[in-house]
Interface confidence: medium
């Protein structure tokens, strides 16, 4: 008996071939001997089976002795043995219809779980193997689960169902809803305007939800909500913003925030959360702000940084075109009685300068100038 695997919702064509290459009488029946379809001369006739309007044949092939049974919009319950009767012969074809569906939704938040469920006909014992867009293989039976979805899991999942040495392939498009970056860091000199961007890693037709930026300033004992906003069909509208600092927010995606100026008291870490309509859970992106200030008070030239810096970052003070006078893995460096000239304060990581602030030290009878 020939075995054919079909996919729920798809169309399948079961073949039936006569030895004579001409149009002769045939009919297809199911295992209950109920007639599905057949012919009367050049006319297609249909029997009382539950397939009725979903069943068809190709009249153009009858003259060549081919009498296929086409079943459209396959259902799991269409799994059966189909019998083609032609020239006093019976050809049996076993059709097994499988379905593979994702739990609830194919748009999932980063960190959530994806469950794929296999629908199969009674008596079948299929095995399933799925390959994620990043090449990860998962095997299972009736259900397959992937916990802690990551951004790289977005894309087409290819799942192969194996039964009786035959296989059928399913493709499921999964969209992982996340920000492009889990975390970002902005380095600014004191007084500069700060731009924060929160690009999303997905595109959908309509995007609705609400969000908030909580900020933990390094100098503050507790975190504070800096801004709350709504998102309606990709349009951003601010609900509430603190008076200090007064953030500005772009009206279109990607989410974009402007801090009027970088100040030591604003340096710290923020967490932008976005709750999407009809989704449980929230998207998160961490943002960090490091602020540098170079000052000269009396005979002391000081350079300080505030905010989340890693222990391997180096802070240096140097006179332009000269060797560093002082370099430390600390948040403040200073030089006593600095000589006149343009001094540079540098924050660097493995030799790469992340932030630079210049301060002009004038001869001792003058006051310093900050360019």
């Amino acid at each position: 008996k020939k075995v054919v695997l079909g996919k729920k919702g798809d169309t399948v064509e079961l073949t039936c071939t006569a030895s004579q290459k001409k149009s002769i009488q045939f009919h297809w029946k199911n295992s209950n001997q109920i007639k599905i379809l057949g012919n009367q001369g050049s006319f297609l006739t249909k029997g009382p089976s539950k397939l009725n309007d979903r069943a068809d044949s190709r009249r153009s092939l009858w003259d060549q002795g081919n009498f296929p049974l086409i079943i459209k919009n396959l259902k799991i319950e269409d799994s059966d043995t189909y019998i083609c009767e032609v020239e006093d012969q019976k050809e049996e074809v076993q059709l097994l219809v499988f379905g593979l569906t994702a739990n609830s939704d194919t748009h999932l938040l980063q960190g959530q779980s994806l469950t794929l469920t296999l629908e199969s006909p009674p008596g079948s014992s299929p095995s399933v193997q799925c390959r994620s867009p990043r090449g990860k293989n998962i095997q299972g039976g009736k259900t397959l689960s992937v916990s802690q979805l990551e951004l790289q899991d977005s894309g087409t999942w290819t799942c192969t169902v194996l039964q009786n040495q035959k296989k059928v392939e399913f493709k499921i498009d999964i969209v992982v809803l996340a920000f492009q970056k889990a975390s970002s860091i902005v380095y600014k000199k004191e007084g500069e305007q700060v731009e924060f961007s929160f690009p999303l890693a997905f595109t959908v037709e309509k995007l609705t939800g609400s969000g908030e930026l909580w900020w933990q300033a390094e100098r503050a004992s507790s975190s504070k909500s800096w801004i709350t906003f709504d998102l309606k069909n990709k349009e951003v509208s601010v609900k509430r913003v603190t008076q200090d600092p007064k953030l500005q927010m772009g009206k279109k995606l990607p989410l974009h925030l402007t801090l009027p100026q970088a100040l030591p008291q604003y340096a710290g870490s923020g967490n932008l959360t976005l709750a999407l309509e009809a989704k449980t859970g929230k998207l998160h992106q961490e943002v960090n702000l490091v602020v540098m200030r170079a000052t000269q008070l009396q005979k002391n030239l000081t350079c300080e940084v505030w905010g989340p810096t890693s222990p391997k970052l180096m802070l240096s003070l140097k006179l332009e075109n000269k060797e560093a006078k002082v370099s430390k893995r600390e948040k403040a460096v200073w030089v006593l009685n600095p000589e006149a000239g343009m001094w540079q304060c540098l924050l660097s990581d493995s030799g790469q300068v992340l932030l630079e602030s210049n301060i002009k030290v004038l001869p001792t009878w003058s006051t310093p100038v900050q360019p």
Epitope: R240, V241, K246, P260, Q261, A262
Partner: antibody, heavy 118, light 111 residues
Framework: QVQLVQSGAEVKKPGASVKVSCKAS????????IHWVRQATGQGLEWIGE????????YSNAKFKDRVTITADKSTNTAYMELRSLRSDDTAVYFC???????????WGQGTLVTVSS | DIVLTQSPASLAVSLGQRATITCKAG??????????MNWYQQKPGQPPKLLIY???NLESGIPARFSGSGSGTDFTLNIHPVEENDAATYYC?????????FGQGTKLEIK
């Protein structure tokens, strides 16, 4: 101690412009927002706008948006508020202010009387 | 804009008694457990003086005779016991949302 010292009284004709200054001392000028508030004679207080002196980012009340420009000069620790196309109902005392540790305006300039008269 | 309505427009209180001024906001000025309402005192020819911030916090240097209360849309400034020096105009101000707005003022007279 924190001090905000404003420029002297001005008399202007309708249609002219006025620029009021506010010199800050006793704190790091770029660390705090400077606000501008006005008060017509015998009337209440009205917020005009504000500036972040470090970056020069300014925000103003929509009522004044097309007529007001708020600026700051870091080198002199001075904030400015310029009001254009003056009308007689712009006659008022103009104050600059700075918040304290809370959300209220704890420090105020002495006020600048601007009289608009033909 | 958030409209702040003060009442009464003026009041006369005897020395040593309690003065109560109310301020009603056109919408809630609460957020995250705080009420963004401030109170000022202003005497003729002087700039306003901050008395209370965030509804109930006393500004440093202000005597404890002044107290603020309320949340949401309804706020109260109490002065008790009233002193001669308290004769002035009092303003409420919201710092919840731009544009920042003030009440129309309440003139306090001491009898």
């Amino acid at each position: 101690q924190v001090q905000l010292v404003q420029s002297g009284a001005e008399v202007k004709k309708p249609g002219a412009s006025v620029k009021v200054s506010c010199k800050a001392s006793g704190y790091t000028f770029t660390d705090y927002v400077i606000h501008w508030v006005r008060q017509a004679t015998g009337q209440g207080l009205e917020w005009i706008g504000e500036i972040y002196p470090g970056s020069g980012s300014a925000y103003s009340n929509a009522k004044f948006k097309d007529r007001v420009t708020i600026t700051a000069d870091k080198s002199t620790n001075t904030a400015y508020m310029e009001l254009r196309s003056l009308r007689s109902d712009d006659t008022a005392v103009y104050f600059c202010a700075r918040r304290g540790n809370g959300t209220g305006f704890a420090y105020w300039g002495q006020g600048t009387l601007v009289t608009v008269s033909s | 804009d958030i409209v702040l309505t003060q009442s009464p427009a003026s009041l006369a209180v005897s020395l040593g008694q309690r003065a109560t001024i109310t301020c009603k906001a056109g919408q809630s000025v609460d957020y995250d457990g705080d009420s963004y309402m401030n109170w000022y005192q202003q005497k003729p020819g002087q700039p306003p003086k901050l008395l209370i911030y965030v509804a109930s916090n006393l500004e440093s240097g202000i005597p404890a005779r002044f107290s603020g209360s309320g949340s949401g849309t309804d706020f109260t400034l109490n002065i008790h016991p009233v002193e001669e020096n308290d004769a002035a105009t009092y303003y409420c101000q919201q710092s919840y949302k731009d544009p920042l707005t003030f009440g129309q003022g309440t003139k306090l007279e001491i009898k």
